[in-house]
């Protein structure tokens, strides 16, 4: 049954508009991962590639960010653009390619010895307990290599999956992003036809765990294209 494969990332209570509160993004919003309201193009294929429209960085791939394609362009028209490499200009962390962050308007290399999240001025307080902070890279301080930041546990706010503990990923949850469990075998997953094409999901599931891939559930082959249930299955 459907319930047997739902997991902690799956939708138990339908989100807006079915769940009693309203979501108003810049364009189409899905009622559940994999279900898109008219007007969206979540299932854009690579073969017929067009610039992928987006409202936020997390709707793009890991090597992309969301922005207007022209400098000073119409803010209402945004697409996924290739991330910026080291030493390129930036305005926020998501513009920089993985392994880099935006410091003083330039993409610079992350210190791999430390937690990838941002560190507040209150360094000792932040490192003294479990609450992962993700603030102000511009105030980043060089710390003893022994001082590691606790990675986010399930339900913690995050910016990227590297902010989360092992077995968790950073996924949209309404207007925030939180650490959620990577999916296990048999759990419902969301199949994206193009790398990073997360659509405008109100909240996202994580990806399938190691050795698993998101495939149509065997008994759902007869179902229509839009209603096929995908689950994490062994390769």
């Amino acid at each position: 049954t459907l319930n047997s494969v739902l997991n902690s990332n799956a939708i138990k209570n339908l989100p807006p508009p079915l769940g009693g509160a309203a979501g108003h993004p810049g364009s189409a919003v899905s009622a559940a991962p994999g279900i898109l309201y008219p007007g969206g193009n979540k299932y854009q294929t690579i073969d017929n590639y067009q610039p992928y429209p987006c409202a936020e960085d997390e709707e793009c791939g890991t090597d992309e960010y969301c922005a207007s394609p022209t400098r000073g362009g119409d803010a209402g028209v945004q697409i996924c653009l290739a991330c910026r490499k080291r030493r390129k200009r930036c305005m926020r962390h998501a513009m920089c390619c993985p392994g880099n962050y935006c410091k003083n308007g330039i993409c610079v290399s992350s210190d791999q010895n430390h937690f990838r999240g941002e560190i507040e001025e209150t360094i000792t307080e932040s490192f003294g307990n479990d609450h992962s902070t993700l603030d102000g890279y511009s105030r980043r301080t060089t710390l003893s290599s022994k001082m590691y930041h606790t990675k986010g546990q399930e339900g913690s706010v995050c910016l990227r999956s590297s902010d989360c503990a092992s077995g968790l990923c950073c996924a949209r949850h309404f207007w925030s992003k939180i650490c959620k469990p990577v999916l296990k075998e048999g759990q419902v997953c969301t199949k994206h036809r193009r790398k990073g094409s997360h659509g405008l999901e109100i909240f996202q599931r994580c990806y399938c765990g190691e050795g698993l891939s998101c495939r149509i559930q065997k008994d759902h082959h007869q179902a229509s294209n839009s209603s096929r249930l995908h689950t994490c299955q062994r390769h």
Epitope: L6, G19, A21, A22, H24, E56, H93, D135, G155, V157
Partner: antibody, heavy 115, light 108 residues
């Protein structure tokens, strides 16, 4: 350190409007979703609205839907709540807070709706 | 909507005693998307616990959270004078976000 400062509260007649502001500092504002929560005098906490880091996604409690509008200006590190068609039951202290679980809160601003 | 019911409504204890506050959800939360807050008169709430069991920045170790599904608990191992306040639980599993009605911890 993280600081949130609300302003814009006051006395307004039923049917009137108010715009609340929340000035944020001490963190990278556009990295975070923001939330408005209210508390009627002597009562508990009630979630009002939420907005994503870029402002593209907004959510509202049924009790304020169609009357309140949440927005943000990331260039000014400021969160807003435009409140129209105010009712007596909207009387409360309004707090802005960071993220979906509210890890930092402002001091609150009192909105009184009365004739 | 998910209704959170806190009990007891009031807890009368002395400094040094252990406080156990309960928060029960009307539906299974499935994930540990529950937070606890402390509020003192005339002040804004303060986050204590998020993700059901993670202590927030600057929160003393005497505060701990536990539970899953529908039953969650906030424990204060040894009450300090500054701990006497109202405590709220909040779920962020689904919309609308909801809070419990609060538990007042008062000096006996």
């Amino acid at each position: 350190q993280v600081q949130l400062v609300e302003s814009g509260g006051g006395l307004v007649q039923p049917g009137g409007s108010l715009r609340l502001s929340c000035a944020a500092s001490g963190f990278t504002f556009n990295n975070y979703g923001m939330t408005w929560v209210r508390q009627a005098p002597g009562k508990g906490l009630e979630w009002v609205s939420g907005i994503s880091g870029s402002g593209s996604y907004t959510y509202y409690a049924d009790s304020v839907k169609g009357r309140f509008t949440i927005s943000r200006d990331n260039s000014k590190n400021t969160l807003y709540l435009q409140m129209n068609s105010l009712r007596a039951e909207d009387t409360a202290v309004y707090y802005c807070a960071r993220t979906i679980y509210m890890d930092y809160w402002g001091q609150g601003t009192l909105v009184t709706v009365s004739s | 909507d998910i209704v959170l019911t806190q009990s007891p409504a009031t807890l009368s204890l002395s400094p040094g005693e252990r406080a156990t506050l309960s928060c029960r959800a009307s539906q299974n939360l499935f994930s540990p998307y529950l937070a606890w807050y402390q509020q003192k008169p005339g002040q804004a709430p303060r986050l204590l616990i998020y993700g059901a069991s993670n202590r927030a920045t600057g929160v003393p170790a005497r505060f701990s959270g536990s539970g899953s599904g529908t039953d969650f608990t906030l424990t204060i191992s040894s009450l300090e004078p500054e701990d006497f306040a109202v405590y709220y639980c909040q779920q962020y599993m689904t919309l609308p976000l909801t809070f419990g009605q609060g538990t007042k911890v008062e000096i006996n």
